[in-house]
């Protein structure tokens, strides 16, 4: 075994167990866990006479190290006297000594509770120049107490702290206040209030909480839309900062590129929200080729009242690519709304999730405000899907009963677009190269959270309608139920209601 210095422990009796008329009393010192032998134990008894006896060392079975006890018996006025047991272990080092000073007996005591409290921010929600940490040492039996402040385990300058003690009935409380600079506090150091009492150590520690985004301010950086990137060929990215408190001092949004190359001129917009916060957006035009080749763009947000800058970066999504499948459907006529129809477009199994959806009528792109498209959601597989919904009027379909749903996506070939045509009245439609016969089955979202019936006639499906596999060449994502209409007559299918 290698050389090991001893751990030293005082051995005392409980004061209440010593008779008040006792003329002598014995106390001890345990030195344990040392190797090799020997240890030398001496006692300082002050002015009192005492006899000492050191017991032979015993071997600790598991470690092979040694332990020994030295006993001191004193007589006379021992009650208030302090005694020092001095243990030397020369094999550890010639000057290795451990002193333990203690009284003859240990009183029952209530240990302190140690808790650190932190001063609050100033009125504006900012850190003041100095931060106060208050160490509350409460509820202990009155007695000598020692408070030390540590910074990352190192004893701090006493000049930083002040302490005061109060007694409440049988118990005492002490508080020590540490004044830290904002600099210290923000340096992510750990501060510990260490209390020594009755030979025991009690402590509590604290540090600045990690700030994800300062005081609820959030920044978002968008990628260019596939439409802007591949169709308009003028991609932009937008840095959006929300939940800013309107205040003096400018919010600065600064753009940079990871390559260090210069950035284009950005445009900025500020909007006061109804809840009193400020939203700032900065839009930066980026080069189509730069983006496609994987350039990284950074937006840095600074403000005098932000404790630190917010950084956001964006680049082309990495990972596997998959082109979207596009399916377009028309809803049947609904009682009471003969002059309106809803068209639906399911776009699925694409990767990555960036996609633009457009609707066209008469070869003209309809305004985005006309249709509503969901955010991309993951399929049960590895791809994504979206639904797009368009309301059309009788005037439109009577003018030309063909509407096109187009998806713009980087994996679509040859021109980053996939499109499908849909007619309100498929039997009457003239059709086109891109139009497609309505499927043998209707796809509808399985979620019935709207409480819609499964069929037009109520909660019971139409007798000729059943849920089934439908056509194998019309795959639907697992999120969709399938309702198959057993066709009669010439119409290949009819829609009797919602699944």
């Amino acid at each position: 075994a290698s050389t090991q210095s001893p751990s030293v422990f005082p051995l005392t009796r409980c004061c209440k167990n010593i008779p008040s008329n006792a003329t002598s009393v014995t106390l001890g010192c345990l030195a344990t866990g040392y190797f090799p032998e020997p240890v030398m134990v001496t006692w300082d008894t002050g002015s009192l006479n005492g006899t000492t006896m050191t017991l032979p060392a015993t071997t600790l079975t598991l470690s092979g190290h040694y332990a020994t006890i030295s006993l001191l018996t004193v007589s006379g006025a021992w009650a208030k006297q302090m005694f020092t047991c001095r243990v030397a272990h020369t094999p550890s080092s010639t000057d290795w000594v451990d002193n333990k000073t203690f009284s003859v007996c240990s009183r029952d005591f209530t240990p302190p509770t140690v808790k650190i409290l932190q001063s609050s921010c100033d009125g504006g929600g900012h850190f003041p120049p100095t931060i106060q940490l208050l160490c509350l040492v409460s509820g202990y039996t009155p007695g000598t107490i020692n408070i030390t402040w540590l910074e990352d385990g190192q004893v701090m300058d006493v000049d930083l702290s002040t302490a005061s003690t109060t007694q409440e009935g049988e118990l005492a409380s002490t508080q020590s206040e540490l004044t830290l600079s904002q600099k210290h506090w923000l340096s992510d150091r750990t501060y510990t209030c260490q209390v020594t009492y009755q030979g025991h150590t009690f402590e509590d520690s604290t540090k600045k909480c990690a700030d994800s985004n300062p005081r609820g301010v959030s920044a978002y950086l968008s990628r260019p839309s596939p439409f802007d990137l591949f169709i308009r060929k003028s991609p932009t990215i937008t840095c959006l900062v929300v939940d800013l408190a309107p205040s003096k001092g400018t919010v600065n949004l600064t753009w940079s590129r990871a390559s260090g190359k210069p950035v284009n001129h950005s445009t900025r917009k500020e909007e006061k929200q109804r809840n009193g916060t400020l939203t700032v957006t900065s839009t930066l035009p980026v080069g189509t080729r730069d983006w496609i080749e994987g350039e990284t763009y950074q937006c840095r947000v600074t403000h005098p009242h932000l404790p630190r800058a917010l950084m956001r970066s964006t680049t082309k999504t990495s990972g596997p690519r998959a082109a979207p499948e596009v399916y377009a459907f028309a809803t049947p006529e609904w009682p009471g709304s003969r002059d309106k129809r809803t068209l639906a477009c399911l776009i699925q199994n694409f990767m990555p999730e960036d996609i633009s959806v457009q609707w066209l009528h008469n070869e003209v792109q309809l305004p985005d405000a006309r249709h509503s498209t969901t955010q991309p959601r993951k399929t049960k597989g590895s791809g994504f899907f979206v639904f797009s919904r368009l309301e059309v009027t009788r005037a439109e379909w009577e003018q030309k009963d063909e509407f096109i749903c187009r998806a713009v996506h980087e994996a679509a070939s040859p021109s980053q677009t996939v499109q499908r045509a849909v007619s309100v009245n498929p039997g009457l439609a003239g059709g086109s190269a891109q139009s497609q016969r309505a499927p043998d089955r209707v796809l509808c979202h399985s979620g019935q959270q709207q409480g819609l019936p499964r069929a037009a006639g109520g909660s019971v499906p139409h007798p000729r309608c059943h849920c089934g596999a439908g056509r194998a060449d019309w795959p639907g994502p697992p999120e969709l139920d399938v309702c198959v209409e057993e066709a009669e007559g010439e119409a290949p299918w009819t829609w009797t209601g919602l699944c």
Epitope: D159, S181, K183, D188, P304
Partner: antibody, heavy 114, light 110 residues
């Protein structure tokens, strides 16, 4: 001691990075600050970086300047420079435990001019 | 924002005399204040930190005092070599500050 890389003449709108290196002590153990002084003017605080790399800046900096560190250097990256940025730039070590700068570099002159 | 105001901007005294420079913080900074001496063409030199602690190698003629918001640097037994510009600096805050230094005081020794 501390030393800053040589300053130089920069045209308005240009960029420059100053590097601070140490000899005789390990830079990585200390918080560091950058301070500048325009000709004939007083000292002006630019920013501060903790030993762990957390940075804070004077409110006038407005993200034009960035302080960063490696295990052996502390850099001050300056962008969109204007003639008002003409000054001697100092790096300084915070070495007292009370936030004071006990060791300063000799300073390097940066001139922004057409 | 925390602002440091230093007065006077300039002070003149004879060799052997005493000068007093004041520094006021707009918010309490406890004792987180240091004083620097700067001579033309040189970097600043730390004189006093923690409001009143003398930096290594600084003569005891330099004395710092104060805490909270009011601080003073006193230079007694003035020597010709003391002619310089003196700056106070708050060492507490790093957020929302325009300058951590006072405006400086030029000391002229006659």
């Amino acid at each position: 001691s501390l030393g800053e890389s040589r300053g130089r003449l920069v045209t308005p709108g240009g960029s420059l990075t100053l590097t601070c290196t140490a000899s005789g002590f390990s830079l990585s153990s200390y918080a560091m600050g950058w301070v500048r002084q325009a000709p004939g003017k007083g000292l002006e605080y630019i920013g501060w970086i903790s030993a762990g790399g957390t940075t804070y800046y004077a409110s006038w900096v407005n993200s034009r300047f960035t302080i960063s560190r490696t295990s052996t250097t502390v850099d001050l990256e300056m962008t969109s420079l204007t003639t008002e940025d003409t000054a001697t730039y100092f790096c300084a070590r915070e070495g007292t435990g009370w936030g004071a700068y006990d060791i300063w570099g000799p300073g390097t002159l940066v001139t922004v001019s057409l | 924002a925390l602002v440091m105001t230093q007065t006077p901007a300039s002070v003149s005294a004879a060799v052997g005399g005493t000068v007093t420079i004041n520094c006021q913080a707009s918010q309490s900074i406890h004792k987180y204040l240091s004083w620097y001496q700067q001579k033309p063409g040189q970097p600043p030199k730390l004189l006093i930190y923690r409001a009143s602690t003398l930096a290594s190698g600084v003569p005891s003629r330099f004395k710092g005092s104060g805490s909270g918001t009011q601080f003073t640097l006193t230079i007694s037994d003035l020597e010709c070599d003391d002619a310089a510009t003196y700056y106070c600096q708050q060492d507490a805050a790093v957020i929302s500050i325009d300058n951590s230094f006072g405006g400086g005081t030029e000391v002229v020794v006659k």
